[in-house]
């Protein structure tokens, strides 16, 4: 039976949420963000084998065409299905303020 | 000046909409779709260099971390930003029906 969450490549090899520890300098934010000084960035990393966490019909099509024409059509890609919001304390023209960003941290992942 | 739509790799090399001509057999649909017999599949293909069609803040983060840790963090990926709906005439248990799919054909592309 098809199982969209069982990785045929082995544990942890397929599309899933990873956490990467990054400084403001790593992120290129040091000139406009004051806090936090470090971020636990959640992002989607891993392979997208056939039928694994397919986001939609388009992902199915893409996988089928990739198998037929691998040099023309790439395999589906592991990307965020949704995001967790996060606040940054940032410098602006008018001073320092708290800003909420809705699209900073991946919440869960799928293959598109 | 930054230009999110100018491809630094040369014309047509960066993330954009491509059309791939496919039969029902190519798509693996021959056993459940009656019409159309061929589909002009629009999909997103191409590289995602820095600042090119970045979908959101997450894409910027991913690119910055990819440059720092290319073996750990992949580059952003070219995926649909939106879809065009399409109707399929399909076989069902009770006969034939027309079904609209909202997520079959990519309408435009961005890097995530």
């Amino acid at each position: 039976a098809r199982n969209g969450d069982r990785c045929p490549l082995g544990p942890g090899r397929c599309c899933r949420l990873h956490t990467v520890h990054a400084s403001l300098e790593d992120l290129g934010w040091a000139d406009w963000v004051l806090s936090p000084r470090e971020v636990q960035v959640t992002m989607c990393i891993g392979a997208c084998p056939s039928q694994f966490r397919e986001a939609n019909m388009h992902a199915q099509i893409k996988m089928n065409l990739h198998r037929l024409k691998p040099d023309t059509v790439p395999a589906p890609c592991c990307v965020p299905a949704s995001y967790n919001p996060m606040v940054l304390i940032q410098k602006t023209d008018t001073g320092v303020s708290l800003q909420t960003y809705d699209d900073l941290l991946a919440k869960d992942c799928h293959c598109v | 000046a930054r230009n999110g739509d100018r491809c630094p790799l040369g014309p047509g090399r960066c993330c954009r909409l491509h059309t791939v001509h496919a039969s029902l057999e190519d798509l693996g649909w021959a056993d459940w779709v009656l019409s159309p017999r061929e589909v002009q599949v629009t999909m997103c293909i191409g590289a995602c260099p820095s600042q090119f069609r970045e979908a959101n803040m997450h894409a910027q983060i991913k690119m910055n971390l990819h440059r720092l840790k290319p073996d750990t963090v992949p580059a952003p990926c070219c995926v649909p930003a939106s879809y065009n709906p399409m109707v399929l005439i399909q076989k069902t248990d009770t006969g034939v029906s027309l079904q609209t799919y909202d997520d079959l054909l990519a309408k435009d592309c961005h890097c995530v």
């Epitope: 004051l34 806090s35 936090p36 996060m86 606040v87 940054l88 304390i89 708290l98 909420t100 | -």
Partner: antibody, heavy 118, light 107 residues
Framework: QVTLKESGPGILQPSQTLSLTCSFS??????????VSWIRQPSGKGLEWLAH???????RYNPSLKSRLTISKDTSSNQVFLEITSVDTADTATYYC??????????WGQGTTLTVSS | DIVMTQSQKFMSTSVGDRVSVTCKAS??????VAWYQQKPGQSPKGLIY???YRYSGVPDRFTGSGSGTDFTLTISNVQSEDLAEYFC?????????FGGGTKLEIK
Amino acid sequence: QVTLKESGPGILQPSQTLSLTCSFSGFSLTISGMGVSWIRQPSGKGLEWLAHIYWDDDKRYNPSLKSRLTISKDTSSNQVFLEITSVDTADTATYYCVRAGWDFFDYWGQGTTLTVSS
Amino acid sequence: DIVMTQSQKFMSTSVGDRVSVTCKASQNVGTNVAWYQQKPGQSPKGLIYSASYRYSGVPDRFTGSGSGTDFTLTISNVQSEDLAEYFCQQYNSYPWTFGGGTKLEIK
């Protein structure tokens, strides 16, 4: 817009437990980096930070009062709570709840006054 | 705990003058210092974050400076509405601590 409002008993007797509620609106305590602190100020004196609760339920306390303090939250009802056990006259003060993004205090409540008296 | 010392409890100044409120940390806190203004009968309000950055909407006559252990809040062209108490605070490490406050009186 962002608002925070503290509520409490007003008057307590020594050795009783103080229960404070901070009701807020205009932001969510589910967002990464968001938090709420409790800070108190005896009349005519300085500010004392008591406790902080983060979006992920991480809690921080002032060590000088830690054994008496409990901070908690109810994100669905947009409330943060502080309990102080065994109050004494030294706990007489105005208690403020304050919104903080990470360590950036940007919105303060109007404060609620507690008097401890026998 | 890090002790924040505001040695001057009271300062007197005149409208139009320039005044500097100082704050000393008992150990290095980098630039992790904020300043707050509390007018009589009101809640405190943020003025300066990260030692030198004004909160959004704070007039530019308020300036913060310093790093390590010595910090200064300078008010240039003092206005009558600046009558208030000013507190420094460190957020470099827990417990977050405040200075004792400096009351600004307008002559």
